[in-house]
């Protein structure tokens, strides 16, 4: 059965937008005016995983690209990457765990927890123009709260 998806953009709680930085990396920075067109549009798919009232498992693909955010171990550390997939097979309802994030809604803000690595979250730095990464702490210097903006298909 086809997987349900929606198109959206994400901004961190400091209102930084996410843009491509090279072919396989995202960075976060403040955008204004026409520069807003640079921000990446995600195709957020609703997939297999732990589901409750405030937690929904999703996969985050880049719209019209065969790239998905995924979580893997690099040098023994959970790491966020953009992974290329076969567009004939993705998205699917039952995605591999490394592609799955628990979208957690708390006080109108969203967190994205890795299903592969519990308590690791999609994060941005306080500093401008830095890579989006997988962070193992909440409530510290790094930012783990996001807002989502719907984009028409």
């Amino acid at each position: 059965a086809p997987v349900r998806s929606l198109n959206c953009t994400l901004r961190d709680s400091q209102q930084k937008s996410l843009v491509m930085s090279g072919p396989y990396e995202l960075k976060a920075l403040h955008l204004q005016g026409q520069d807003m067109e640079q921000q990446v549009v995600f195709s957020m798919s609703f997939v297999q995983g732990e589901e409750s009232n405030d937690k929904i498992p999703v996969a985050l693909g880049l719209k019209e690209k065969n790239l998905y955010l995924s979580c893997v171990l690099k040098d023994d550390k959970p790491t966020l990457q953009l992974e290329s997939v076969d567009p004939k097979n993705y998205p699917k309802k039952k995605m591999e765990k490394r592609f799955v994030f628990n979208k957690i809604e708390i006080n109108n803000k969203l967190e994205f927890e890795s299903a592969q690595f519990p308590n690791w979250y999609i994060s941005t730095s306080q500093a401008e123009n830095m890579p989006v990464f997988l962070g193992g702490t909440k409530g510290g210097q790094d930012i783990t709260d996001f807002t989502m903006q719907f984009v028409s298909s």
Partner: antibody, heavy 119, light 106 residues
Framework: QVQLQQWGAGLLKPSETLSLTCAVY????????WSWIRQPPGKGLEWIGE???????NYNPSLKSRVTISVDTSRNQFSLSLSSVTAADTAVYYC?????????????WGQGTLVTVSS | QSVLTQPPSVSVSPGQTASITCSGD??????AFWYQQKPGQSPVLVIY???KRPSGIPERFSGSNSGNTATLTISGTQALDEADYYC?????????FGGGTKLTVL
């Protein structure tokens, strides 16, 4: 409390078509996937296929050419059809619900229907 | 077709810990589920999403999944835990059960 009640012919001849129906009582019908699983006597479980409320299906590749799963949302029922049966299709057939709260796996099962294929 | 391999049988003394394994290619990158089936009954879900317990399932049941192996662990095994246990996962667009393990409580 969710209940799945299934019925259908229990004795078939080779080459006939197996038909089973499962009725769902309690809970929403549209929020779940609905599956069929079978278990030959003394053997393990085999997943047959699934359907959602819109009629979208996935099937086990080994059975795909003979299987049809359909849904009747007005009655909260779904059905299994397996054509050209042989003795190898003798099994207990179960219907089950796949729920988002359990990670889209089978959390409620019917009581099972023994289907015997014999000439 | 994808294969999930389980030992046909596992024996354990009452009060001891039973471990039932399920092996499959890159199984740790998928979600694993476990069912208990007693003779003449429908299967019952005991572990979902690798390590979560449905309500009503005792705490002695736990699960893990990494690499190529998922494991169901029953600590303080009781006589009533004697049953067949099946692992379950997905392969692309379809679902696969392991061959089943008969747990005997000696």
């Amino acid at each position: 409390q969710v209940q799945l009640q299934q019925w259908g012919a229990g004795l078939l001849k080779p080459s006939e078509t197996l038909s089973l129906t499962c009725a769902v009582y309690g809970g929403s019908f549209s929020d779940y996937y609905w599956s069929w699983i079978r278990q030959p006597p003394g053997k393990g479980l085999e997943w047959i296929g699934e359907i959602d409320h819109s009629g979208s299906t996935n099937y086990n590749p080994s059975l795909k050419s003979r299987v049809t799963i359909s849904v009747d949302t007005s009655r909260n029922q779904f059905s299994l059809s397996l054509s050209s049966v042989t003795a190898a299709d003798t099994a207990v057939y179960y219907c089950a619900r796949a729920s988002p709260s359990s990670g889209w796996t089978l959390d409620y099962w019917g009581q099972g229907t023994l289907v015997t294929v014999s000439s | 077709q994808s294969v999930l391999t389980q030992p046909p049988s596992v024996s354990v003394s009452p009060g001891q810990t039973a471990s039932i394994t399920c092996s499959g290619d890159k199984l740790g990158d998928k979600f694993a589920f476990w069912y208990q089936q007693k003779p003449g009954q429908s299967p019952v879900l005991v572990i979902y999403l690798d390590n979560k317990r449905p309500s009503g399932i005792p705490e002695r049941f736990s699960g893990s999944n990494s690499g190529n192996t998922a494991t169901l662990t029953i600590s303080g095994t009781q006589a009533l835990d004697e049953a067949d246990y099946y692992c379950y996962a997905w392969a692309d667009t379809y679902e696969v059960f392991g061959g089943g393990t008969k747990l005997t409580v000696l």
